[in-house]
Interface confidence: low
């Protein structure tokens, strides 16, 4: 065979979102027949020649990023791309807020605010999340995700974490949820979208708001100030898609 | 679980010394084989690690350039070359295992559970 | 690194006496500490895993425990042999750090 290997699959079973000392497995996926498979860490030295990896019980200090490849005879493949894979419930939960009310008409205009006494820097908003643990807070900080022109797609569940650049991967547990009811119309609500920019989009105006704008499942994110929040190539997650929005507050 | 260090060492300035450490009573490849540092009358200094499965290996930043960690899968035999001694290197020098993959470096359970008798290392001239 | 701050360094005391030793961790180090004892042919044996689990062949006198950024060996009541060096190891990040040890010698 000539060139690389094609490179295998990774993904966290149930979720890459895992709270703290609840289990989760890491799975690498190559074609059959596979002779060894490598599964890494990164950023730790840190690597097992095993496909599978079960936590049983989430460390904060198994959070990170982590890829996979494997060997066929001496060829090695090309690596999987990386998968996030990140604590919850590290910190306390934020509050999350609609802005003016969690009840909005079709076309009209919300702003989902999420509130936290840490002074986080990040924070991401889920159509759907997962509970876990709390922790003492110290200041008020704020992310507002303002939503134009709302259409019933933007029905559902919400939740939001916090969490800071410095440690991207260990997140706060998520807010109570806060479902947003679209009046004014009968369309069937969708997902949010399953390409999401990375957890860790920095934004260089500390005070930016971020936009969430849908149009047919697909969504940018972009500061009043015209800042695009794009991760590099490179930090794009891997594995089951992760619904959400990330902020730099 | 068994692990046999090698006998003292003498050595000169300057020198080079190669510790073993042979384990026995598990598989050899499937847990990590971590180096410890205790001077007379002091107290005890994690070195390094390394993962005979894959030769990984991990160091604590003040012994990079002093120590370094090999492993011989076929005679389930860890190592520890040390370089370039001084009178600062004199000390015992112990294994230690657990078992090693990506969640078990930090399962307690296994985590230094099993030590070597220690080998004492004397730099003189 | 995360330093680990062990008292007393030395203690002398009876048998059948009640003891404690403690490491106070210099961050946060969530109950990722493991207590050792030396004993004076240099041997390790590792006592408690996981800052409060007893290794199985140790006898319960020896118990773990945690208050804050202190965690504790305590033995319940004082037999010869347990007249040895003890040291607390940190593993919650690399590198990992020992305590600077307690010299238990009889009274």
């Known amino acids: 065979q000539s060139g690389p290997l094609p490179k295998p699959s990774l993904q966290a079973l149930p979720s890459s979102l895992v709270p703290l000392e609840k289990p989760v497995t890491l799975r690498c996926q190559g074609p059959p027949g596979v002779d060894l498979y490598r599964l890494e860490k990164l950023s730790s030295s840190r690597y097992q020649d095993q496909a599978v990896l079960f936590i049983p019980a989430m460390k904060r200090s198994l959070a990170g990023r982590y890829r996979c490849s494997y060997q066929n005879g001496s060829l090695w493949s090309l690596p999987s791309d990386q998968l996030e894979l990140v604590a919850t419930g590290v910190f306390a939960k934020p509050s999350l807020s609609a802005q003016p009310g969690p009840a909005v008409s079709s076309g009209g205009d919300v702003t989902l605010q999420c509130q936290t006494r840490y002074g986080f820097d990040q924070f991401a908003l889920y159509k759907e999340g997962d509970p876990a643990p709390y922790k003492n807070p110290e200041r008020w900080y704020r992310a507002s995700f303002p939503i134009i022109t709302v259409t019933a797609a933007h029905s559902g569940t919400y939740r939001c974490y916090s969490f800071s650049s410095r440690d991207p991967y260990l997140w706060s547990a998520p807010s109570d949820p806060l479902e947003l009811v679209v009046t004014g119309t009968s369309v069937t609500p969708s997902r949010l979208p399953t390409e999401p920019p990375s957890p860790v989009a920095e934004f260089s105006e500390a005070t930016a708001e971020l936009t969430v704008s849908f149009t047919n499942e697909v969504f940018t994110t972009e500061t009043s100030r015209s800042i695009t929040a794009s991760p590099k190539e490179s930090d794009s997650p891997a594995g089951p898609a992760r619904q959400y929005y990330t902020k730099g507050n | 679980v068994q692990l046999q260090q090698s006998g003292a060492e003498l050595a000169r300035p300057g020198a080079s010394v190669k510790l073993s450490c042979v384990a026995s009573?598990?598989?050899?490849?499937?847990?990590?084989v971590n180096w410890m540092k205790q001077r007379t009358g002091q107290g005890l200094e994690w070195i390094g690690e390394?993962?005979?499965?894959?030769?990984?290996?991990y160091y604590n930043e003040k012994f990079k350039g002093k120590a370094t960690l090999t492993a011989d899968k076929s005679s389930s035999t860890a190592y520890m070359q040390l370089s370039s001694l001084t009178s600062e290197d004199s000390a015992v020098y112990f294994c230690?295992?657990?078992?090693?993959?990506?969640?078990?470096?930090?399962?307690?359970?296994?985590?230094?559970?099993?030590w070597g008798q220690g080998t004492l290392v004397t730099v003189s001239a | 690194d995360i330093q680990m701050t062990q008292s007393p360094s030395s203690l002398s005391a009876s048998l059948g006496e009640r003891i404690s030793l403690t490491c106070r961790a210099s961050?946060?180090?969530?109950?990722?500490l493991n207590w050792f004892q030396q004993k004076p042919d240099g041997t390790f044996k590792r006592l408690i895993y996981?800052?409060?689990s007893l290794d199985s062949g140790v006898p319960k006198r020896f118990s773990g425990s945690r208050s804050g950024s202190d965690y504790s060996l305590t033995i319940s009541s004082l037999e010869s042999e347990d007249f040895a060096d003890y040291y607390c190891l940190q593993y919650a990040s690399y590198p990992y750090t020992f305590g600077g040890g307690t010299k238990l010698e009889i009274k």
């Open positions: 009573g598990y598989t050899f490849t499937d847990y990590y």
């Open positions: 961050q946060d180090i969530s109950n990722y």
């Open positions: 390394i993962y005979p499965g894959s030769g990984n290996t």
């Open positions: 230690a295992t657990w078992r090693g993959n990506l969640y078990y470096d930090y399962d307690a359970e296994t985590l230094f559970a099993y």
């Open positions: 996981a800052t409060s």
